[in-house]
Amino acid sequence: MKVLQEPTCVSDYMSISTCEWKMNGPTNCSTELRLLYQLVFLLSEAHTCIPENNGGAGCVCHLLMDDVVSADNYTLDLWAGQQLLWKGSFKPSEHVKPRAPGNLTVHTNVSDTLLLTWSNPYPPDNYLYNHLTYAVNIWSENDPADFRIYNVTYLEPSLRIAASTLKSGISYRARVRAWAQCYNTTWSEWSPSTKWHNSYREPFEQH
């Protein structure tokens, strides 16, 4: 039994880091393998993660961590019984994938303005809470070419756009994702999308 693709890990910078790897053949990850992880600091305890299958030869493990900070550095040991298959390390702050924003809502009752709001996925005491910026994706269900991205570079989890920038009388969907420049993170997954019917009063034509 050998590791074909070494574990790569990403952290949500809150409580979970996810490591994925591939074995050289079909493997029952949960019965055959264990991923041990331990902070490099004095008196820290070793923890065991039981991996799950992720395709025939793929494995995935969700490492539980509390209160991640930039100094944290973990040793990782992948075991098959008594055999050490791979040894490595992982610094969560250098491999951050933020959590996806939630509760995306479109408020259509604000005088021809669309107000999109969503929730920051982190509690206020988390370092990323004040460092997230967002991308909002809006698209038409009727026209695949009507697809747009709005970058929200301020901290407030909201976006205002004129309803007239979208076509009237058709349905749109929106979703939002997040990233943090301070840790050069990857983008989060997209939030679940929300749907609304776009309608607004056309201004009277001047003759």
Epitope: L39, F41, L42, L43, E45, S70, A71, D72, S93
Partner: antibody, heavy 120, light 107 residues
Framework: DVQLVESGGGLVQLGGSLRLSCAAS????????MSWVRQTPEKRLELVAA????????YYADSVKGRFTISRDNSKNTLYLQMSSLRAEDTAVYYC?????????????WGQGTSVTVSS | DIQMTQSPSSLSTSVGDRVTITCKAS??????VVWYQQKPGKSPKLLIY???YRYTGVPSRFSGSGSGTDFTFTISSVQPEDIATYYC?????????FGGGTKLEIK
């Protein structure tokens, strides 16, 4: 309100022994890593000993290894430091501290300190 | 052992001034650095952990930065209640070690 109250300090003869206690309240003592830090008369700080939440793992500074023993009684919310074969350089104010994480790192709660003087 | 060389050892400043204290580690300590404040006759208090994280309830005028071997602690606008000795502390290497302290006085 978090409180760490040290006791047991005092004047002791060279080579003598002393047992320091630290009564903890206002936080979950049984799940906290704890430690003893001392401050010399010259105001230098030194981490003397640390212990994990269940008492199963300990750390000692080289300067006290074999002479000091850190222990805890989670049922009494109390941390101890048994000091023996005391030397002049052990003279210091001893602080009971709580480790912020489940490892030896930042210390977020400190007691008021208890003074230990080793005299010849 | 990793030496934490703190400078200056003492500092005289005026209310409202910006103050910077530095700590240099003898080898790489990542961002495993802490800053404490100790007022006269009191025990130390945690201000900054993991080099730049402000501890709960600590005023925003206190900040920390750095990684590797060079670390900085800043008070953006010194207040009379900031008279104290400030210590840096690394926990990346064993044994954990402290800087010698910087005594802050107000003119």
């Amino acid at each position: 309100d978090v409180q760490l109250v040290e006791s047991g300090g005092g004047l002791v003869q060279l080579g003598g022994s002393l047992r320091l206690s630290c009564a903890a309240s206002g936080f979950t003592f049984s799940s906290s890593y704890m430690s003893w830090v001392r401050q010399t008369p010259e105001k230098r700080l030194e981490l003397v000993a640390a212990i994990n939440s269940n008492g199963g793992k300990t750390y000692y500074a080289d300067s006290v290894k074999g002479r000091f023993t850190i222990s805890r009684d989670n049922s009494k919310n109390t941390l101890y430091l048994q000091m023996s074969s005391l030397r002049a350089e052990d003279t210091a104010v001893y602080y009971c501290t709580r480790q912020r994480g489940n490892y030896v790192g930042a210390m977020d709660y400190w007691g008021q300190g208890t003074s230990v003087t080793v005299s010849s | 052992d990793i030496q934490m060389t703190q400078s200056p050892s003492s500092l005289s400043t005026s209310v409202g001034d910006r103050v910077t204290i530095t700590c240099k580690a003898s080898q790489d300590v990542s961002t495993a650095v802490v800053w404490y404040q100790q007022k006269p006759g009191k025990s130390p208090k945690l201000l900054i952990y993991s080099a730049s994280y402000r501890y709960t309830g600590v005023p925003s005028r206190f900040s920390g930065s750095g990684s590797g071997t060079d670390f900085t602690f800043t008070i953006s606008s010194v207040q009379p209640e900031d008279i104290a000795t400030y210590y840096c502390h690394q926990y990346y290497g064993s044994p954990p070690t402290f800087g010698g302290g910087t005594k802050l006085e107000i003119k």
